[in-house]
């Protein structure tokens, strides 16, 4: 069954003369493996013998192959899937029909194949897109129906028989749909490419030329154009004429409209290559071109600069920047329309030339007040001077000069007063708008530049003030120089450093923090009685009597100040001590007697020790001994002991007497 | 070493007297240097200083005001010892009594006879 | 009569703990104050007398500081057998009074 076999191979296979061919071809024999394979050149079915006859270019069969004249073919197949052939070297007389006899176990077939061998190397072909444009990248590709791994190709790529520089890709084919070998050449041709030359070689590996294609490339362009200018170097003064001619150097297709411009935009009624202006202005300076289109687009030439000469135009100077600030820098320019270039320049400042200023630019650095007012600048070239303009206003801007404080006071100033101070400045430009003071307080400003100090401090040292424009500029402090009465007035103990005590020596001092005038008079007194007029109060030994209340007064010529009231106080040990007896020192016996210990003390007394008439202590720590009931045994001579952290002092003794009762008298 | 041991009945009847004695060994009750005290305790009073007995150059007494009509403290020399009386008792009395020696701070202390008033 | 206020009237504390009692007199009693402890059943012992001085046999975690009116009992590093109520006593006049107390209790 014929349909059990299917092969895929190429139809034709092309080669020339002393080449090879390569055969690639797939079979499927599903009855089977293949046990006999031949290759036929042209062969004919003999119907007679039932088999084929032609040319056996090749033979295996079970026994072994059979070895083909020097080995030109051979089966590079298998027994079951592949059927590739190859024949090297191939000659012309090898062109025909091959056929391939196959036979399995139970099957037979013949499959053609055709071989097409050329007397010499065969020329590939170059195809191009149905359109080339300038500038846009084309793929030029070159095909060879040729590709065998026996015989190395290559081709190369030649524009007016010149290799072209651009980087070939080959690629070769060698499968059971197609034999080939493929050169692409990736190529952005410009108009100066249109019907030049394309070939496209083929060399053997040795570079040898074999064969050749040639196409002679058609690129669509733009225009491309030539302008001319009479006279050439397109200077010309007021009045002359000028001619301009366009030349067409190349189109693709033909071109169809002409037109001419000046700085881009289209003159009117001015469609053909010559371009007459007649008694020009300097209005038709600029930059002219024409421009030709076609099917592709317009094609412009390159810009003509026309130059129409004329004396500089009345000058304007412009201020880089107006107002400026004192001290920066300002530059100013002249401008005036003039061709060619003004070479000269003459400034103006108020009217007055600036001596030695010629150019085009003048750069102040540093900017006075002086350099306010009206530039103006003329300008000169080769034909001629121009007129002076309107100028240009320089304003200097700077902060207010020579700024003082005055005090419109009579002096001395006294502590208290109200004060008047106001502040002058020579100029300011802009006007002064605000004043500033320092120190700040709750001042008043009755008016601009004015200050009203009301009831000044002592400690109202200086003032300076501040005319503000867009800057503050501060004056000199002022001394106001307030007069005051001495402050802070103050009794200090000098020694002795730690508290006083009763015997020691003792200084006192009158302190204060200020005075002006810093002449002073000390004053010191207790319970409203002058003690002494010098700044220390001096007690060489000290007793509590002289504890108290102390001030002392510091006064000068505005006035004078007393210090708090500074208590003395004196530490001294118990003293003074004595026993008094409640109710009496004679007590019926089975009352109540209340002994008490009474004492001057400083600090007061922390505790008693209380005795009898033989020195023995009794068990009381208070100031009151409370006997009850009272016995007559009690009778006798009690002291007491006071104690304090300076000391101790002791009463004298003092006699208790307890008598009997009548209900005693009466037992008895 | 100074001890003091209390005698005396624990139960009294209400209006009648509270008689307690602390005997003193170790020390002498006409020592010049002390004071010889009675305390109570109850649970609603805490620790309530009745009186103190001493000697210097005589005998004397201090009596707490909540009781000074109503109480006596007596040393008897001649037993070493000190006593004390709380007349017409009532239940308020009930209370946990000491005796102590005070020297500089109340330094020994009886064993403490609880005393309940009731009829 | 001289009234002893104790704060507080109760406290716990764990072994080890720093206690402080203050008592405070309603007049100047210089520094003639003494600190007691009693236990359940016992009469009380008497630990510091005249405000700071240690009892002698008592050990030295027990202190006091104070005069006038103020005064402040110590017990450093508190130990099992020290959980016990804690008066204050002045002696500077009749009548001597107590402190109502301070129980220090476990935690």
């Known amino acids: 069954d014929s349909s059990k076999w299917v092969f895929e191979h190429p139809e034709t296979l092309y080669a020339w003369e002393g080449a090879c061919v390569w055969i690639p071809c797939t079979y499927r024999a599903l009855d089977g493996d293949l046990e006999s394979f031949i290759l036929f050149h042209n062969p004919e079915y003999n119907k007679n013998t039932s088999k084929f006859d032609g040319t056996r270019l090749y033979e295996s069969t079970k026994d072994g192959k059979v070895p083909s004249e020097q080995k030109r073919v051979q089966f590079l197949g298998d027994k079951n899937k592949n059927c590739t052939l190859s024949i090297h070297p191939v000659h012309l007389n090898d062109s025909g029909q091959l056929g391939l006899r196959m036979e399995s176990k139970t099957e037979k077939w013949m499959e053609r194949i055709h071989l097409n061998v050329s007397e010499r190397p065969f020329p590939p072909h170059i195809q191009l897109p149905p359109e080339i444009q300038e500038s846009q990248e084309v793929t030029l590709t070159c095909l060879l129906n040729f590709s065998c791994y026996g015989y190395p190709i290559q081709l190369q790529w030649l524009l007016e028989g010149v290799p072209m520089r651009q980087a070939a890709v080959t690629s070769t084919s060698l499968t059971i749909k197609s034999v080939f070998t493929r050169s692409e050449l990736k190529f952005s041709p410009q108009w100066s490419h249109h019907g030049k030359i394309v070939t496209c070689q083929l060399q053997d590996a040795d570079g040898k030329f074999l064969s050749n294609d040639t196409v002679q490339l058609n690129v669509k362009h733009t225009p491309k154009l030539e302008i001319k200018v009479t006279p050439s170097d397109a200077i010309v003064r007021e009045g002359d004429s000028v001619t301009m001619t366009c030349e067409v150097s190349s189109s693709n297709p033909e071109y169809t409209t002409v037109s001419w411009l000046k700085d881009g935009t289209s003159l009117k009624k001015q469609n053909t290559f010559t371009l007459n202006l007649r008694e020009v202005t300097k209005d038709q300076s600029g930059k002219y071109c024409c421009q030709v289109s076609n099917d592709v687009g317009p094609g412009r030439s390159e810009e003509v600069f026309l130059q129409v000469q004329y004396a500089p135009e009345p000058s304007t100077v412009q201020i880089l920047h107006s107002p400026a600030v004192e001290g920066s820098q300002v530059e100013f320019l002249c401008m005036s329309l003039a061709n060619p270039l003004p070479t000269n320049y003459t400034w103006y400042h108020n009217g007055k030339e600036m001596q030695g200023r010629t150019e085009e630019k003048v750069h102040i650095p540093k900017i006075l007040p002086w350099h306010a007012g009206t530039y103006s600048c003329v300008a000169e070239n080769i034909l001629g001077t121009g007129q002076r303009g309107p100028g240009a206003e320089l304003d200097v801007q700077y902060p207010p000069k020579k700024v003082t404080t005055v005090i419109q006071n009579p002096m001395p100033i006294r502590e208290g007063d109200t004060v008047t101070l106001s502040c002058n400045y020579n100029s300011s430009n802009p006007s002064v708008t605000r004043y500033e003071w320092k120190p700040h307080g709750a001042w008043e400003e009755p008016s601009l530049g004015v200050l009203k100090i009301q009831n000044v401090g002592w400690d109202n040292t200086t003032i300076a003030c501040a005319a503000c424009n867009s800057w503050c500029s501060w004056a000199s402090p002022v001394a106001l120089n307030v007069q005051y009465a001495p402050r802070d007035v103050r009794v200090r103990k000098i020694k002795p450093l730690s508290e006083i005590h009763s015997g020691n020596s003792v200084s006192l001092q009158c302190d204060f923090s200020s005075s002006h005038p810093k002449e002073v008079q000390f004053f010191w007194e207790k319970n409203g009685r002058l003690l002494g007029k010098e700044s220390q109060l001096n007690f060489d030994s000290i007793s509590p009597e002289d504890a108290g209340s102390y001030s002392c007064w510091v006064n000068n010529s505005i006035g004078q100040t007393a210090s708090k009231a500074w208590t003395l106080e004196v530490l001294y040990a118990p003293r003074r001590l004595r026993v008094s007896m409640s109710p009496g020192d004679q007590v019926m016996e089975g009352k109540s007697a209340t002994l008490t210990c009474e004492s001057d003390a400083n600090p007061p007394v922390s505790h008693y020790t209380w005795f009898d008439w033989n020195n023995q202590s009794l068990p009381y720590h208070s100031q009151k001994l409370r006997l009850e009931p009272v016995k007559v045994q009690h009778s006798g001579a009690y002291w007491c002991q006071g104690t304090n952290s300076v000391g101790k002092g002791r009463s004298p003794l003092s006699t208790l007497t307890v008598y009997y009762s009548p209900e005693t008298i009466g037992r008895r | 070493q100074v001890q003091l041991q209390q005698s005396g009945p624990g139960l009294v009847e209400p209006s009648q007297t509270l008689s307690l004695t602390c005997a003193i060994s170790?020390?002498?009750?006409?020592?010049?240097?002390?004071?010889w005290n009675w305390i109570r305790q109850s649970p609603s009073r805490g620790l309530e200083w009745l009186g103190r007995t001493y000697y210097r150059s005589t005998w004397y007494n201090d009596y707490a005001g909540s009781v000074k009509s109503r109480i006596t403290i007596n040393p008897d020399t001649s037993k070493n010892q000190f006593s004390l009386q709380l007349n017409s008792v009532t239940p308020e009395d009930t209370a946990v009594y000491y005796c102590?020696?005070?020297?500089?701070?109340?330094?020994?202390w009886g064993q403490g006879t609880m005393v309940t008033v009731s009829g | 009569d001289i009234v002893m206020t104790q704060s507080p009237s109760s406290l716990s504390a764990s072994v080890g703990d720093r206690v402080t009692i203050t008592c405070r007199a309603s007049?100047?009693?210089?520094?003639?104050l003494n600190w007691y402890q009693q236990k359940p059943g016992k009469a009380p012992k008497l630990l510091i007398y005249?405000?700071?001085n240690l009892e002698t046999g008592v050990p030295s975690r027990f202190s006091g500081s104070g005069s006038g009116t103020d005064f402040t009992f110590t017990i450093t590093s508190l130990q099992p057998e020290d959980f016990a109520t804690y008066y204050c006593?002045?002696?500077?006049?009749?009548?001597?009074?107590f402190g109502g107390g301070t129980k220090v209790e476990i935690k």
């Open positions: 006593q002045q002696s500077y006049t009749t009548p001597l009074t």
């Open positions: 007049q100047s009693i210089s520094s003639y």
């Open positions: 005249d405000a700071s």
């Open positions: 102590a020696r005070d020297r500089n701070g109340m330094d020994v």
């Open positions: 170790g020390d002498s009750v006409s020592s010049d240097s002390v004071a």
